[in-house]
């Protein structure tokens, strides 16, 4: 019993005066608390308590469940205790089988003994299975058996408290340990799509997948820069122990333009947080934006190839695409394909392949595309660069020599005179008249130039050269002159190809 200094309040005195008392089942428990300021007896077992305001605690026929700690308390709040074991060979353990352990922490298997004199108080696996090799425990007959530093691997471990009684092993009811994992990493979050494009009135639905070791992970959808509560639905699965998956689906049944913005799926646990975002763009109606990948004015040499390429954004999906030239639709020579295979792709490419273009195939090539909301078009002006072709070269009745040439770009015509039999015509002759004529062909066709000189200026035999040229090449025509007396004759005009 405790001893105190005189004058100070002292704790109550208990009879019998020992810390532990062993009684047999069916026997009487009689405990007397002596204190002038007696307040109450408290009985505690498996962390449950009962009170008694009588200073003598009497249990006429003790049962195993009367095993526990009896505490007498006085008005000063001072107390004294005695632990009573009610020995019952048929009930060696009192149990509370709720058994939860937090990873890396200790947990108590609540199986206090009713008989402190049994031996080998320990834990055993169910069905004769051994306990994990690293499982450490400390037995306490009055409280149970403390498992030290619970491991995740112990989850759903089935075990019994065990003692040896008269040489035989006696097992308690089974305990199943439920381990709550410690969070040792942030949750893993992912989103079904990184961006969404919708028309007003369409449904917006996006799913966030959250993965963690337990369902205790917190998650929510948030609108950036907004406190508005969002409507979410959940599905969740346990893919085995400590592999939990939740799908949080955010839905806006009829999206509006002002719903556009960034939505964040946020998840956190005691270790930390993670988030992922998706962007919603809501448009009042669909659109098509076309971007030419080459200049819309195209110059190409005769006989060469050219690809007319556009990229375009179309939302909703494009329904009709076509390339048109001179009111005729191309049925082949073109291809149209999405820029990427991404589910949210709205960008497409269309290519028209023009091969071995002729001078007559210049003109406006138009790409048209439409979806359910809008139409759009883009035109390419294609100019075919052609070497000049001399269409006519004549001596007119008025004595003029006339040369007409066609080509693109517009040819320049120069005149030269070669006296006698010289091959090189170097002396240039100034034209009397130069005109650009309207071509009877399609626009973007060859440009026709007419140039004239006065033949009366030539006094000697020789050759007159009409030379038409542009960036692509040159062509010449020749007039041969011979004088018979005073008469000048054009012997045969002819052309020479000059590469």
């Amino acid at each position: 019993q405790p001893s105190v200094s005189p004058g100070e309040p002292s704790p109550p005195s208990i009879h019998p005066g020992k810390s532990d008392l062993i009684v047999r089942v069916g026997d009487e428990i009689r405990l007397l608390c002596t204190d002038p300021g007696f307040v109450k007896w408290t009985f505690e077992i498996l962390d449950e308590t009962n009170e008694n305001k009588q200073n003598e605690w009497i249990t006429e026929k003790a049962e195993a469940t009367n095993t526990g700690k009896y505490t007498c308390t006085n008005k000063h709040g001072l107390s004294n205790s005695i632990y009573v074991f009610v020995r019952d060979p048929a009930k060696l353990f009192l149990v509370d089988r709720s058994l939860y352990g937090k990873e890396d922490n200790d947990t108590l298997v609540r199986c206090p003994l009713t008989d402190p004199e049994v031996t080998n108080y320990s834990l055993k696996g169910c069905q004769g299975k051994p306990l994990p090799k690293d499982l450490r425990f400390i037995p306490d007959p009055k409280a149970g058996i403390m498992i030290k530093s619970v491991k995740r691997a112990y989850h759903r471990l089935c075990l019994h408290c065990s003692v040896d009684q008269e040489g035989k092993s006696v097992l308690s009811e089974k305990f199943i340990l439920k381990v709550r994992p410690a969070f040792k990493a942030v949750p893993v979050v992912s989103v079904s799509k990184a961006s969404y494009l919708l028309r007003e009135g369409e449904e917006f639905t996006v799913t966030c997948t959250i993965k963690d070791v337990s369902s205790s992970v917190y998650s929510t959808w948030k609108r950036e820069n907004s406190q508005t509560k969002l409507q979410e639905k959940y599905n969740s699965w346990h893919h085995g122990d400590f592999n939990y998956e939740r799908q949080a689906t955010l839905t806006i049944s009829s999206a509006r333009v002002n719903d556009s913005g960034v939505f964040m799926c946020y998840a956190n646990n005691t270790f930390g947080s993670a988030n992922v975002t998706t962007t919603l763009e809501v448009v009042d109606k669909g659109f098509i934006n076309i971007f030419p990948m080459i200049n819309t004015t195209v110059f190409v040499n005769d006989g060469e190839n050219v690809d007319l390429i556009v990229e375009y954004e179309a939302f909703p999906k494009p329904e009709h695409q076509q390339w048109i030239y001179m009111n005729r639709t191309f049925t082949d020579k073109w291809e149209d394909y999405p820029k990427s295979e991404n589910e949210s792709n709205i960008r497409y490419v269309s290519e028209l392949h023009l091969t071995r273009l002729k001078g007559t195939e210049g003109g406006t090539y138009t790409f048209l595309v439409s979806n359910s909301d809008v139409n759009a078009a883009i035109a390419f002006n294609v100019y075919v660069n052609t070497k000049p072709e001399i269409l006519t070269y004549d001596r007119l009745v008025n004595g003029m020599l006339q040369c007409v040439a066609a080509g693109f770009p517009e040819p320049t015509i120069d005149w030269y005179f070669c006296p006698g039999t010289e091959q090189r015509c170097s002396a240039s002759v100034l034209p009397v008249d130069v005109q650009t004529l309207n071509s009877s062909g399609p626009p973007f066709g060859k440009l026709v130039v007419q140039s004239s000189i006065d033949s009366s200026a030539f006094k000697h035999n020789g050759t007159v050269e009409c030379k038409a040229y542009n960036d692509v090449g040159k062509t010449s025509a020749y007039f041969n002159f011979a004088f018979k007396g005073n008469n000048k004759e054009q012997i045969h005009p002819h052309t020479l190809f000059t590469p």
């Epitope: 449950e48 089988r97 709720s98 939860y100 937090k102 069905q127 759903r156 089974k174 709550r180 346990h238």
Partner: antibody, heavy 117, light 111 residues
Framework: QVQLVQSGAEVKKPGASVKVSCKAS????????MHWVRQAPGQGLEWMGV????????SYNQKFKGRVTMTTDTSTSTAYMELRSLTSDDTAVYYC??????????WGQGTLVTVSA | EIVLTQSPSSLSASVGDRVTITCRAS??????????MHWYQQKPGKAPKLLIY???NLESGVPSRFSGSGSGTDFTLTISSLQPEDFATYYC?????????FGQGTKLEIK
């Protein structure tokens, strides 16, 4: 003997919060898990979550996601359940229940929370 | 989550009748051969009261006319001879894994 005594009925407006208390006696408060269960009028029982003994870890039914917080005050042996952003769907009787020997052996008397504009 | 489906949803019976209520789980609630399935009785305006724990164990103080059976996914609560005080709503509940779930309830009414 074990007793769980809950706070009285509450009437709240939509968007408000409510904090229900559950005072425990007759056992060592810190040794047992405390669960919260609710029951909407004419409906079944719905588990909201648990605050575990010891470190006071919690585990919530994801249905209540960031809206629910369970706490304890060990000095008064009282458990609390706070529910935020209330809507009319949260009108229900809220119960605390002590887990003993793997089952809900003791229940509070219930607290009616009415959410009404 | 584990979904519990009770049948029937409601039942009319007379005093003295034998009544059986079933509860089916969407997946097994057993661990090491032990079923984490419990049965509760609830009367109007009152908190639920535990009747049967771990599928077949009678809670202390509950009359022996109540019994439970089953394992895995299929469970039964039986009242061998209905008494007037037994007219109430009965719920099954699993605590094998979180979130813990209840059946939707079976309302037992006087015929």
């Amino acid at each position: 003997q074990v007793q769980l005594v809950q706070s009285g009925a509450e009437v709240k407006k939509p968007g408000a919060s409510v904090k229900v208390s559950c005072k425990a006696s007759g056992y060592t408060f810190t040794s047992y898990n405390m669960h919260w269960v609710r029951q909407a009028p004419g409906q079944g029982l719905e588990w909201m979550g648990v605050i575990y003994s010891g470190q006071g870890d919690t585990s919530y039914n994801q249905k209540f996601k960031g809206r629910v917080t369970m706490t304890t005050d060990t000095s008064t042996s009282t458990a609390y359940m706070e529910l935020r952003s209330l809507t009319s769907d949260d009108t229900a009787v809220y119960y605390c229940a002590r887990e003993r020997d793997t089952r809900f052996g003791n229940w509070g008397q219930g607290t009616l929370v009415t959410v009404s504009a | 989550e584990i979904v519990l489906t009770q049948s029937p949803s409601s039942l009319s019976a007379s005093v003295g009748d034998r009544v059986t209520i079933t509860c089916r789980a969407s997946e097994s609630v057993d661990i090491y051969g032990e079923s984490f399935m419990h049965w509760y009785q609830q009367k109007p305006g009152k908190a639920p009261k535990l009747l049967i724990y771990h599928a077949s164990n009678l809670e202390s103080g509950v009359p022996s006319r109540f019994s439970g059976s089953g394992s895995g996914t299929d469970f039964t609560l039986t009242i061998s001879s209905l008494q007037p005080e037994d007219f109430a709503t009965y719920y099954c509940q699993q605590n094998r894994e979180e979130p813990y779930t209840f059946g939707q309830g079976t309302k037992l009414e006087i015929k």
